[in-house]
Interface confidence: low
């Protein structure tokens, strides 16, 4: 039987097939895909754009950063307010102080230690 390049279309991931010759074709890929048949998801992960130890996770035509627990936001640039997340982080009347990448306790009445429990 006669080979028709675009019937059926060899283009995957939503790519559009265009016949360029008797036996040749070209796939116009949707954003985020590449390859002669649009078979490859472009790895959008950048190298040093995720901040504060975030790990880049590739998506289709986008990327996100998997942040360590103390950081948040798309690029791990926003500090998590641990004092809001853990209302009882500081014991014995100590005051919680949020800091970049963590938190600290300001202890009172002779108490000490990381959480004012000593």
């Amino acid at each position: 039987s006669l080979y028709v390049p675009c019937a059926p279309s060899p283009c995957v991931n939503g790519g559009t097939c265009r016949q360029t010759g008797d036996f040749t074709f070209e796939c116009n890929c949707l954003p985020g895909f590449e390859g002669s048949t649009c078979e490859r998801n472009i790895d959008d992960c950048p190298n040093h754009r995720c901040q504060n130890g975030g790990v880049c996770v590739d998506g289709v035509n986008t990327y996100n950063c998997r942040c360590p627990p103390q950081w948040t936001g798309q690029f791990c640039t926003e500090d998590v307010d641990e004092c809001l997340l853990q209302p009882n982080a500081c014991q014995n009347g100590g005051t919680c102080a949020n800091r970049n990448g963590g938190y600290g306790c300001v202890c009172v009445n002779g108490w000490s230690g990381d959480d004012c429990s000593e």
């Epitope: 790895d43 190298n47 690029f75």
Partner: antibody
């Protein structure tokens, strides 16, 4: 289709400031870092800095720290680069480019800034 | 900053011929994440640079397979087989492994 459209050419006097805009379309603006790259006539491009549209966070080439300001307007999906205290060697083409693959995947058409007294 | 050195500076070619451009970095471009962030761009006269190859050997969307990239560590090569008129212009390598990102000085590919 991803597009970055920049503002037109500018002529400035030494010591003045210039603000170049870069209107992004065809993708989710907040999902990608926008870089600014400059190129002097007959020379290779030079990375100037980038801005994270979602948070407004910026990072600069040390060479331009203190003189370059990068901002975004998320409502109009536009990035801006302002350069102050212009000198004659700032007569270059400024490009905005979108991040991806650890590189610069899509570029604006360029904006020529001429600094002349 | 990482210095990127391209050779040759100028390269006269015949249409249909093959081209090889070298890019050498002043230090290894292997990133701690295991990737090597070395990329190739073409800047046609009066136009913006356009991405051809990212991370050594991956062709960007719509880039013909006559373009290929290779190399490792500090030595990288861009090859164009069967040069066509639209391939003429200045080719730049870029490293984005180390901060700040730095470009090579360019290789001008022109008709012999």
């Amino acid at each position: 289709e991803v597009q970055l459209v920049q503002s037109g050419a500018e002529v400035k006097k030494p010591g003045a400031s210039v603000k170049v805009s870069c209107k992004a379309s065809g993708y989710t603006f907040s999902n990608y870092v926008i870089h600014w790259i400059r190129q002097a006539p007959g020379q290779g491009p030079e990375w100037t800095g980038y801005i994270i549209p979602g948070s407004g966070g910026t990072k600069f080439n040390e060479k331009f720290k203190g003189r370059a300001t990068l901002t975004v307007d998320k409502s109009s999906t536009t990035a801006y680069m302002e350069l102050s205290r212009l000198r004659s060697d700032d007569t270059v083409v400024y490009y905005c480019a979108r991040d991806g693959a650890g590189s610069f995947t899509y570029w604006g058409q360029g904006t020529l800034v001429t600094v002349s007294s | 900053d990482v210095l990127m050195t391209q050779t040759p500076v100028s390269l006269p070619v015949s249409l249909g011929g093959q081209v090889s451009i070298s890019c050498r970095s002043s230090q290894s471009l292997v990133h701690s994440d295991g990737n090597t962030y070395l990329h190739w761009f073409l800047q046609k006269p009066g136009q913006s640079p356009q991405l051809l190859i990212y991370r050594i050997s991956n062709r960007f969307s719509g880039v013909p397979d006559r373009f290929s990239g290779s190399g490792s560590g500090t030595d990288f090569t861009l090859k164009i087989s069967r040069v066509e008129p639209e391939d003429l212009g200045v080719y730049y390598c870029l490293q984005s492994t180390h901060f700040p990102d730095t470009f090579g000085g360019g290789t001008k590919v022109e008709i012999k």
